[in-house]
Amino acid sequence: VPRSSSPDWAQCQQLSRNLCMLAWNAHAPAGHMNLLREEEDEETKNNVPRIQCEDGCDPQGLKDNSQFCLQRIRQGLAFYKHLLDSDIFKGEPALLPDSPMEQLHTSLLGLSQLLQPEDHPRETQQMPSLSSSQQWQRPLLRSKILRSLQAFLAIAARVFAHGAATLTEPLVPTA
C-alpha cells in the first residue's frame, strides 16, 4: 500500500503517545483545570485546528478514507510547530536546560514527516500572525499553547491507536 494512502499506523501510534507524554511533562497543570466547553465558534479563535466530527476521524470515517483526518492532524501539528518556533518559547524567561520542549519540537516534526504523503506537495495553511510577545506575557502564552496542544495530541493519539488496531495491513505470508 503506498504511503500516501495509509501511514504506518503503529509508528504513528508510538510517536503520538510519546508526544502526549512530552507535552504533559512540558506543562503539567497544577490544581484544578477548567475544562473548556467546545463552543460553536471556537474554530475561529486564532485559526486553531481542532479535530471535529466533520474531519472523518471517527472509526467509520477512518475506514472510509483516512486522508481527511490525517490532513487535519497534519495541519494541527504544523500550527503548533509554528508556535513552538516563535519567540514565545525562544525568548526570555529562558526555558530550563532540561526542559522537554526540544524533544517535543523534534517529535512533532517527526510525526509530521511520517504523515506527509510522498506524492503530495506540502499543503499551505493560514498560520496565526504573531506579534512580538513581551517577557511577562510568555509564561501565560506558553501555558495556554501547551494545554491546547495536550488536548489536540490526546485526540490524535486515540486516532492512531484505533488505526493501529484496525487499519494496519496484515502481513501477507510469502509462499
Partner: nanobody, 121 residues
Framework: EVQLVESGGGLVQAGGSLRLSCAAS????????MGWFRQAPGKEREFVAH????????YYADSVKGRFAISRDNAKNTVYLQMNSLKPEDTAVYYC??????????????WGQGTQVTVSS
C-alpha cells in the same frame, strides 16, 4: 464575556498599604489567568502582576517585586493585589484584567473600569 469589577483604591501615605480586589463574573470558565495593570497620568498602561487561575503561579513587574503580592480566591472568582511600602510613583489607575484560555496567541482580553490609587508624600 467576562465582567470585572475592581475595588479597594484610595488615598494613602507613602510607606502605607492598600489591598485591591477584582471580582469576575460571566464566563469565568474561560479564564486562564488574572492580572493587574496600571496607568499613571500621561503614561502608557503598564503590567504589574499576573496569576494563573488554576495553578496559582505568579509573575511580577520588576518595579513592584517584593512589595506587591497577587493572590486569588477561586471560590469567590476574585483576585487581590496587596500593595505594601507604597511610593508616590505607584500613583495610577489600577486595572484588573482576565486572560481567556481560548485565545492562544494574545493575552488579557477582558478589562475592568479601573480604581484610582493615590500615594501622597
Amino acid at each position: 464575556e467576562v465582567q470585572l469589577v475592581e475595588s479597594g483604591g484610595g488615598l494613602v501615605q507613602a510607606g502605607g498599604s492598600l489591598r485591591l480586589s477584582c471580582a469576575a463574573s460571566g464566563q469565568t470558565f474561560s479564564i486562564h489567568a488574572m492580572g493587574w495593570f496600571r496607568q499613571a497620568p500621561g503614561k502608557e498602561r503598564e503590567f504589574v502582576a499576573h496569576i494563573s487561575w488554576s495553578g496559582g503561579s505568579t509573575y511580577y513587574a520588576d518595579s513592584v517585586k517584593g512589595r506587591f503580592a497577587i493572590s486569588r480566591d477561586n471560590a469567590k472568582n476574585t483576585v487581590y493585589l496587596q500593595m505594601n511600602s507604597l511610593k508616590p510613583e505607584d500613583t495610577a489607575v489600577y486595572y484588573c484584567a482576565a486572560d481567556d484560555m481560548r485565545e492562544l496567541v494574545t493575552t488579557f482580553h477582558y478589562w475592568g473600569q479601573g480604581t484610582q490609587v493615590t500615594v501622597s508624600s
